[in-house]
Amino acid sequence: SPVPRSTALKELIEELVNITQNQKAPLCNGSMVWSINLTAGVYCAALESLINVSGCSAIEKTQRMLNGFCPHKVSAGQFSSLRVRDTKIEVAQFVKDLLVHLKKLFREGRFN
């Protein structure tokens, strides 16, 4: 049977917590990604940003999980209007910001 959306979001939060807690060296060698607007379409926007990071095993599971939340196919180099114009941040900061936002969505019961 399909995993309930609440459980899937919980799994994603757990994975992001693990990334932030287990981080020793700079995450993904300090790679920079486009900052995103967290107010709408957060899963696809996050995936569109993170998919451009290659060769970083630490976020591969996150990329796969975000893919499960995003209803359309996302490929590298693809950007939606949800990107914050011309602003790049480190992957570590991106993950922290995403985690804070997803935890709030979870607490509010907004799983879709």
Epitope: V3, P4, S6, T7, K10, E11, I13, E14, V17, Q21, K103, K104, F106, R107, E108, G109
Partner: antibody
Amino acid sequence: EVTLRESGPGLVKPTQTLTLTCTLYGFSLSTSDMGVDWIRQPPGKGLEWLAHIWWDDVKRYNPALKSRLTISKDTSKNQVVLKLTSVDPVDTATYYCARTVSSGYIYYAMDYWGQGTLVTVSS
Amino acid sequence: DIQMTQSPSSLSASVGDRVTISCRASQDIRNYLNWYQQKPGKAPKLLIFYTSMKPRGVPSRFSGSGSGTDYTLTISSLQPEDIATYYCQQGLTPPLTFGGGTKVEIK
């Protein structure tokens, strides 16, 4: 020391609104990751979760009672208030407030409880 | 809503006995399972959280285990002060739900 203390009317008439107050000691609901729950227990029965409020005013309710429940906080008084409208004798119970702390993963585990306040609904 | 089913509803055991209480969730709760002890006339007390973690001050004879939908509370050597009702609770997501309780008595 972390302590929670419930206060309520003791006796309420059917159809009236029950107002319960939980006063928090030893921690503040203005602190990130803090939450407070309300739980009730009818005499001789099990525990039923009613509502929850987080430090940032995010609220959740038991769907079976949502239309009758309102949870709010007064950070200046370090209090959480629960209102239950249109009470009925089946709402007779001991009402507890309890603290939840979210750390890392989001736990909903109530680590400190008040002593409870018995509310009887009767005419 | 996630339903929590506890068994047995009551049990009687001798001092020193090993006691196990079971709790089953209606769906996978990913180890977000808490146990509470409620002594007569008192408020519940958190005994175990996140399946097997213990708050400070909980005696070592209490332990928790399980995964997925099935969880267990074990008292390795029952003591007279353990007379109480024990409740499981899922902490995955609201609405938070409790098991019906297990009343533990001494033979």
